[in-house]
């Protein structure tokens, strides 16, 4: 009687425990990569960031891959996307070539199963860095709810990267699991 | 029989909701702080901001602690931080003491263990805020995904406090537990 | 023997999975409307937006309702809402009557039961775009987590809504639940 | 009442200048746009010039760049419109007119000042 | 920039009729920025119209604006003795703001 007891309720409680895992203890997904500076390409176009951290200060990822530059996802489900970006520039580091400047980021989803890449989410504004003030910063700041299939891939581009802020608390984007698809 | 079955029912359910509670419905981790505006301090310095409300109109907290100016983590896990932080001027205020102003948030992390404290993330802009309009407004708003530990501590530093817009939708800060560290 | 414990374990697992689907799978509500650029009201004052996708591009909604402009709440719980507002202006667009403009956003609560709306959060900045440039841009990100009932509605205000980016990455709103009332 | 009166019309030869005022009153000068339209003899009408409320920023015809330019005295309640190299396609009445302040792009015109006649000939 | 061609070029009917007037754009005017403005021999414009269908103040309400994109129209219910006079369209979606050439309505 016991034993049968006991049995039953191994076997109950696995299968409980397997739901929980997968329901919700089974370590959502998510990622925070912070900018990888030593390789910030240079001029003023619109250009994909690729080089970011995954594993280091408070850069993390976990059910997520970063691969060549892309942060892919493993696992379908609907996730809150986020980046934070900031330009800033000294007079020590040199003239600006135009003192009016688009400062903008752009959050795309690659589909690679339909070659295609559509921006999910945008944020910047026009800036007016004058000669007369020695150093000049400015952030953006996106966040979103966006449902993401296994094999998307998630990037950044930037217009002007040479004014990329390369502090991990400056430039950095991310992702986290929400809730499943229905 | 069927007493069997109840008991052994019971015996299974109570682990279940138990294991429930612990998992999901066992109030998550939130606060949403909003700026106590009485007791903001002047200058155009980075201070620290240490007067929030955590317990009227939309501030509030669950399982975590306010004390001392700082949000206390009680529980470790995954947590999502935001900030938002609105500067404004209006000419009937008296005159800046100069045009060109640094408007900064800081979000940052101090482990009381190891006696250290770190930017999680910042944002702002420099403002060229003339005479030529009676009235200036910024804001900022920056958020991410981190791994916070039992006894750390949350603060906001902000440069030109006396700036801050004292309204509660518009300078607050905040956290919410997404999920357990593995 | 067996039967017995296969009867069982199929009315405990129905339990749980019962649990498991009001506790975490069932379908957590959630909204991100997109604008509906085909009815943005002119002028510069203060208006609130009443006309988003919901169903189109990124727009999605589930477990919550979209009418009259306002993003419905049929769920009690805690909520993380969030903005993108982008504004931008071309000189081909027209000339701008006022270099001076102040790009806000709000995002507002309104309960039915005790007719009141209140402000939740805000963001914006005072701009100048002075002829000189031909292109003017700026957004705006707002996000926070606010206790919200069932049948209180979500909706956007916004300044000089002549000045929106109509496009589905630039001006967004959303919310997703992310945990039930104590 | 919102009033807009111009002056400073008058006969001028190909290659001449001229300046042309509009004193307005009834309303707070400094806050709204103004422009300036004209009207051929016969002929419909054309927007020519327009500047800001500030004066920080202005806006011309393709037909009169570089050689109009509009500017307003706001302590006097003044818009001005200085004319040279002017044409013999120039010959219209000047119009001054107020932007509606209501909207942040330029829109209508709302009032219109009673015009003065510019004439260019040899 | 956008081209506004009013047609008819003269329409000639008798006080109490209904007159209808059109504006076509050579390309769709960005949300309901066109005013109509009614001229008389001598005077200034007048304002009648602004944001396709919002009358001006001190219009009386047999003025009526409608149209979208490329084609708007200006209504006047009944035609009064003082009505007779040319009448412009303006857009202000896009710059530079531009006139239709005009439309006459004279007394039949």
């Known amino acids: 009687g016991s034993q049968h007891i006991r049995a039953e309720k191994a076997m109950v409680d696995g299968s409980w425990l397997d739901l929980a895992k997968r329901s919700k203890l089974e370590a959502q997904p998510f990622a925070h990569l912070t900018i990888n500076a030593t390789d910030i390409p240079s001029g003023s176009h619109k250009v994909s960031l690729s080089s970011w951290y995954h594993d280091r200060g408070w850069a993390k990822i976990s059910n997520m891959t970063f691969s060549n530059g892309k942060l892919i996802v493993n696992q379908d489900g609907f996730y809150y996307l986020y980046a934070n970006i900031c330009f800033r520039h000294h007079e020590t580091s040199g003239d600006l070539a135009t003192e009016y400047l688009q400062l903008m980021v752009y959050v795309t989803k690659t589909s690679i199963k339909i070659p295609s890449s559509h921006t999910l989410m945008k944020g910047g504004s026009t800036k007016y860095w004058s000669g007369n003030s020695e150093f000049h910063f400015y952030s953006i700041n996106v966040g979103g709810f966006f449902k993401l299939r296994s094999g998307e891939e998630i990037s950044i581009e930037v217009s002007n990267p040479s004014l990329l802020d390369p502090d991990q608390d400056a430039t950095y984007f991310g992702a986290f699991k929400v809730r499943d698809i229905d | 029989g069927s007493q069997h079955i109840r008991a052994e029912k019971a015996m299974v359910d109570g682990s279940w909701l138990d294991l429930a509670k612990r998992s999901k419905l066992e109030a998550q981790p939130f606060a949403h702080l909003t700026i106590n505006a009485t007791d903001i301090p002047s200058g155009s310095h980075k201070v620290s901001l240490s007067s929030w409300y955590h317990d009227r109109g939309w501030a509030k907290i669950s399982n975590m602690t306010f004390s001392n100016g700082k949000l206390i983590v009680n529980q470790d896990g995954f947590y999502y931080l935001y900030a938002n932080i609105c500067f404004r001027h209006h000419e009937t205020s008296g005159d800046l003491a100069t045009e060109y102003l640094q408007l900064m948030v800081y979000v940052t992390k101090t482990s009381i263990k190891i006696p250290s404290s770190h930017t999680l993330m910042k944002g702002g802009s420099t403002k060229y805020w003339s005479g030529n309009s009676e009235f200036h407004f910024y804001s900022i708003n920056v958020g991410g995904f981190f791994k916070l530990r039992s006894g750390e501590e949350i603060s906001i530093e902000v440069s030109n406090p006396s700036l801050l817009d004292p309204d509660q939708d518009a300078t607050y800060f905040g956290a919410f537990k997404v999920r357990d560290i593995d | 023997g067996s039967q017995h414990i296969r009867a069982e374990k199929a009315m405990v697992d129905g339990s749980w999975l019962d649990l498991a689907k009001r506790s975490k799978l069932e379908a957590q509500p959630f909204a991100h409307l997109t604008i509906n650029a085909t009815d943005i009201p002119s002028g510069s004052h203060k208006v609130s937006l009443s006309s988003w996708y919901h169903d189109r591009g990124w727009a999605k909604i589930s477990n919550m309702t979209f009418s009259n402009g306002k993003l419905i709440v049929n769920q009690d719980g805690f909520y993380y809402l969030y903005a993108n507002i982008c504004f931008r202006h071309h000189e081909t667009s027209g000339d701008l009557a006022t270099e001076y403009l102040q790009l806000m956003v709000y995002v507002t609560k309104t309960s039915i039961k005790i007719p009141s709306s209140h402000t939740l959060m805000k963001g914006g900045s005072t701009k100048y775009w002075s002829g000189n440039s031909e292109f003017h841009f700026y957004s705006i990100n707002v996000g926070g987590f606010f206790k919200l009932r069932s049948g209180e509605e979500i909706s956007i205000e916004v300044s000089n809504p002549s000045l929106l980016d109509p496009d589905q990455d630039a001006t967004y709103f959303g919310a997703f639940k992310v945990r039930d009332i104590d | 009442e919102v009033q807009l009166l111009e002056s400073g019309g008058g006969l001028v030869q190909p290659g001449g200048s001229l300046r042309l005022s509009c004193a307005a009153s009834?309303?707070?000068?400094?806050?709204?746009?103004m422009s300036w339209v004209r009207q051929a003899p016969g002929k419909g009408l054309e927007w020519v010039s327009g500047?800001?409320?500030?004066?920080?920023?202005?806006y011309y015809a393709d037909s009169v760049k570089g050689r109009f330019t509009i500017s307003r005295d706001n302590s006097k309640n003044t818009l001005y419109l200085q004319m040279n190299s002017l044409r013999a396609e120039d010959t219209a009445v000047y119009y001054c007119?107020?932007?509606?302040?209501?909207?942040?792009?330029?829109?209508?015109?709302?009032?219109w000042g009673q015009g003065t006649l510019v004439t260019v000939s040899s | 920039e956008i081209v506004l061609t009013q047609s008819p070029g003269t329409l000639s009917l008798s006080p109490g009729e209904r007159a209808t007037l059109s504006c076509r754009a050579s390309q769709a005017i960005r949300g309901p920025n066109l005013a109509w403005y009614q001229q008389k021999p001598g005077q200034a414009p007048r304002l009648l119209i602004y944001?396709?269908?919002s009358r001006a103040t001190g219009i009386p309400d047999r003025f009526s604006g409608s149209g979208s994109g490329t084609d708007f129209t200006l209504t006047i219910s009944r035609l009064e003795p003082e009505d007779f006079a040319v009448f412009y369209c303006q857009q202000y979606g896009s710059s530079p703001r531009t006139f239709g050439q005009g439309t006459k309505v004279e007394i039949k």
């Open positions: 944001d396709t269908s």
């Open positions: 500047i800001t409320g500030s004066g920080g920023s202005t």
């Open positions: 009834g309303f707070t000068f400094s806050s709204y746009a």
């Open positions: 007119a107020k932007d509606p302040g209501t909207t942040v792009i330029m829109s209508w015109f709302d009032p």
